[in-house]
Structures are given as C-alpha cells and as structure tokens.
C-alpha cells in the first residue's frame, strides 16, 4: 500500500490522543534506555510503511502484536485516514486469522514495540533532518 495520500495530521492526532498511551502501557516496566532504535524512516509515508510492517507482520520471536490494543487502533486509523487502505488489507487479515496465536509478551516483542515508538516519534516530526 502507498501511504502518500493519507491524512497525516489526523493520524498524528490519533496517535497523540490514544495510540501513544497504549504503546506506553505495553512497555510499562521497561526502561526507555533498554533498547536501541535500529529501525528508522525518512518521511511520513515511509514511516507509516515501517509502522505497518513492524505492527502487523509476524517476526521471529514476536508473532503476537496484531491483537494488542495499540495495533488495533493503528489499523483503524490507517483504515479511516488512508484512502483505500481497508481494501488492501482484507486478504492480509484473513491470513492473519488463520495463524493467530495466543498473546505472549516476549523480550523480542518489547524490543519491537520500542522500535515502533521511535518510528511514531519520527512520524510526528517530519521536518527534522535525519541524523
């Protein structure tokens, strides 16, 4: 999906209003310095591409993020403010339902959500030059 036509300001407002708090809740008990940010993004469409990938694509050691509250809200925000996003996700959602596993918070998941927090922060500051 090409995120170029999303309403970035609305997605930012949704993040600041509620998604950010759910990410913090997920990470509660973890020190903010515990993980290094290794995933970056260069502009808002790129950030949303990386956020989608990290939130919804299962990775080795962390297959369970898609049913977390922050993930459901992220999916809803993209569906509302990215024209045509919902239609592209129908097949992906059906595949995800088939392989759904019970929710387990592993260290790998915590690391992944820490990366997500970094991507969201970058999304909210699009005019900053990349280091």
């Amino acid at each position: 999906y090409d995120f170029t036509n999303c309403d970035f300001e609305k997605i930012k407002a949704a993040y600041l209003s509620t998604i950010s708090k759910d990410l913090i809740t997920y990470m509660s008990g973890t020190k903010s310095t515990e993980f290094n940010n290794t995933v970056s993004c260069s502009n808002r469409p790129h950030c949303l591409t990386e956020i989608q990938s990290l939130t919804f694509n299962p990775t080795a050691g962390c297959a369970s993020l898609a049913k977390e509250m922050f993930a459901m809200k992220t999916k809803a925000a993209l569906a509302i403010w990215c024209p045509g996003y919902s239609e592209t996700q129908i097949n992906a959602t059906q595949a995800m339902k088939k392989r759904r596993k019970r929710k387990v918070t592993t260290n790998k998941c915590l690391e992944q959500v820490s990366q997500l927090q970094g991507l969201w922060r970058r999304f909210n500051r699009p005019l900053l030059k990349q280091q």
Epitope: K10, M72, K73, K75, A76, A77, A79, I80, W81
Partner: nanobody
C-alpha cells in the same frame, strides 16, 4: 462555507429534559460523522455522543448512556441530542463537531470518536445549565 449552528440549550431542573439541535451546511452531510462534545468550566472538552450520517452508527460516553440519545435527519442536515434525566453534572457548554472520514468508517471510529483533536469543524456552542 462550512457552518455548524447549535440551539436548544437553556436552564432546566434536575430530572428534566432538553433537546439540542445542530444544523449543518457547507459540506456533504451524509458522509460525515457528527459528535456532541461538552465542556464544563475548568474541565477538558468531553465527547458525549457520536453519529455517522452515513450508516447511523452511534456511540455514547458511559456517563450519558441510557439518558441521552443522538439522532440525525439527513433531509434537514440536522443532528439532535435528546437529553433526559438531566443531572447537575451535565451542566456545560455543548458543541457539535464534524469529521469527514469517521462517518464512512464508523466501526473503526469506535477508538477515536471522543477525541476533539480529530474534528475539522465546530459550532459555537450552546449553554446547558441543570439546577438541583
């Protein structure tokens, strides 16, 4: 240009009823979500009730569930808030607000409808005072 005009506020005794109206113009009413917010002195603006003019889906704040009813008349481009069993704590300025994408995505909007930062257009507000 876009306009939202609220009316129907006033002074009422606890246990009484009021019906607020929000008349809209300047946008495609049938695609929009309209939400009633309220703001009491010294408090944050609070989402009270949401309706999608696209499919009629409604959401309510827990504090008003069973007492307030939101409805829409697409022919008149007007949304109503019927407020029954009013309490002193319902005293506030009531605003209606409109958003263009949450109307056509009402199921996904369950997470976001009550957040004022997401709305594009606002009315000037109408005062509701409930005396004990």
């Amino acid at each position: 240009q876009v306009q939202l005009v609220e009316s129907g506020g006033g002074l009422v005794q606890a246990g009484g009823s009021l019906r607020l109206s929000c008349a809209a113009s300047g946008f495609t009413f049938g695609d929009y979500a309209i939400t009633w917010f309220r703001q009491a002195p010294g408090k944050e603006r609070e989402g009270v009730a949401y309706i999608s003019n696209f499919d009629g889906m409604t959401y309510y704040a827990d504090s008003v569930k069973g007492r307030f009813t939101i409805s829409s008349d697409n022919a008149k481009n007007t949304v109503y808030l019927q407020m029954d069993s009013l309490k002193p704590e319902d005293t506030a300025v009531y605003y209606c607000a409109a958003e263009g994408r949450m109307g056509t995505h009402s199921r996904d909007s369950v997470y976001f409808w009550a957040f004022s930062a997401l709305y594009d257009y606002w009315g000037q507000g109408t005062q509701v005072t409930v005396s004990s």
